[in-house]
Amino acid sequence: MMTGTIETTGNISAEKGGSIILQCHLSSTTAQVTQVNWEQQDQLLAICNADLGWHISPSFKDRVAPGPGLGLTLQSLTVNDTGEYFCIYHTYPDGTYTGRIFLEVLESSVAEHGARFQIP
């Protein structure tokens, strides 16, 4: 039975040209995290593997930095970065937990963080 929950940074906004940290946290489970994938729509941005550490997809190497923790830092943001981001926790023995973050990249300097929320 999957008892864990993923808490994410929820709906967030940031300025064009700036950077943002995407964060997820898995709690309420003793499952072992094998790997965390960060995905944007159908694209794989990065992997944090329990055995082998971080690997950033070559097409994102210039604008994506690992961390802090299991999070992901997006840099040099463009309006095209607006959209859904997913943290996918592969665990044993529970299976897969997925968290969703919506990022809006704003032209203006008004960029406020949204509320945090949980996904069971």
Epitope: T34, I47, N49, L52, H55
Partner: antibody, heavy 126, light 107 residues
Framework: EVQLVESEGGLVQPGASVKLSCVGS????????MSWVRQTPGKTMEWIGN????????NYAPSLKNRFTISRDNAKNTLYLQMTNLRSEDTATYYC???????????????????WGQGVMVTVSS | DIQMTQSPSSLPTSLGDRVTITCRTS??????LRWFQQKPGKSPRLMIH???NLANGVPSRFSGSRAGSDYSLTINSLESEDMAMYYC?????????FGSGTKLEIK
């Protein structure tokens, strides 16, 4: 705790066939690539081949691919190595190793081999 | 196949020494190189992955480096528990290939 336990080896005749097995526990076996590696008595390490997490794809060392076959049964958490027409130069300790997690990218490499079994000695001699 | 030329094959050492083992590759493999340690009667243990990254639980006296097609494993201030065989492995392309091994021995 991740564990890989190979079946017992032993003495086999030249020309004979042997099927080794390796049972994995403490991890999601069906989500990982698995490999076989052997080590000769002279301590030379040789990669034999690997198999995709779902068993649909295998790679082999060219010198061994005609005689060795890797397979897996995910329902039993078991990896196999079928060896045929054995020769004296096949005498070695055979290790199964856990490869990378199924959802990965090329930069993580072909086979992680972070976890190894204890090894099983196969001696080919008449 | 990619050839891995590992040297030296044997290295007499003293405790506290700084030790370097090298593998030279016949083709470019990027950073797709791992180092393994093997003690007598034991299975190999991953020490370095990605040419320079320390594996989980490996003491910080171990380090990996790359200079072109030469890859090195360095042990700063050798300890008795480091006496073992060391192997490099390239995983840039199939078939994966190992170096011939280096045996660390007490002088």
């Amino acid at each position: 705790e991740v564990q890989l336990v190979e079946s017992e080896g032993g003495l086999v005749q030249p020309g004979a066939s042997v099927k080794l097995s390796c049972v994995g526990s403490g991890f999601s076996f069906s989500d990982h690539w698995m490999s076989w590696v052997r080590q000769t008595p002279g301590k030379t390490m040789e990669w034999i081949g690997n198999i995709q997490y779902d068993g649909s794809y295998t790679n082999y060392a060219p010198s061994l691919k005609n005689r060795f076959t890797i397979s897996r049964d995910n329902a039993k958490n078991t990896l196999y190595l079928q060896m045929t027409n054995l020769r004296s130069e096949d005498t070695a300790t055979y290790y199964c190793t856990r490869g990378h997690f199924r959802i990965t990218m090329a930069s993580m490499g072909a086979s992680a081999s972070v976890y190894w079994g204890q090894g099983v000695m196969v001696t080919v001699s008449s | 196949d990619i050839q891995m030329t590992q040297s030296p094959s044997s290295l007499p050492t003293s405790l506290g020494d700084r030790v370097t083992i090298t593998c030279r590759t016949s083709q470019d493999i990027g950073n797709s190189l791992r180092w393994f340690q093997q003690k007598p009667g034991k299975s190999p243990r991953l020490m370095i992955h990605g040419a320079t990254n320390l594996a989980n639980g490996v003491p910080s006296r171990f380090s990996g480096s790359r200079a072109g097609s030469d890859y090195s494993l360095t042990i700063n201030s050798l300890e008795s528990e480091d006496m073992a065989m060391y192997y490099c492995l390239q995983h840039n392309e199939y078939p994966l290939t190992f170096g011939s091994g280096t045996k660390l021995e007490i002088k």
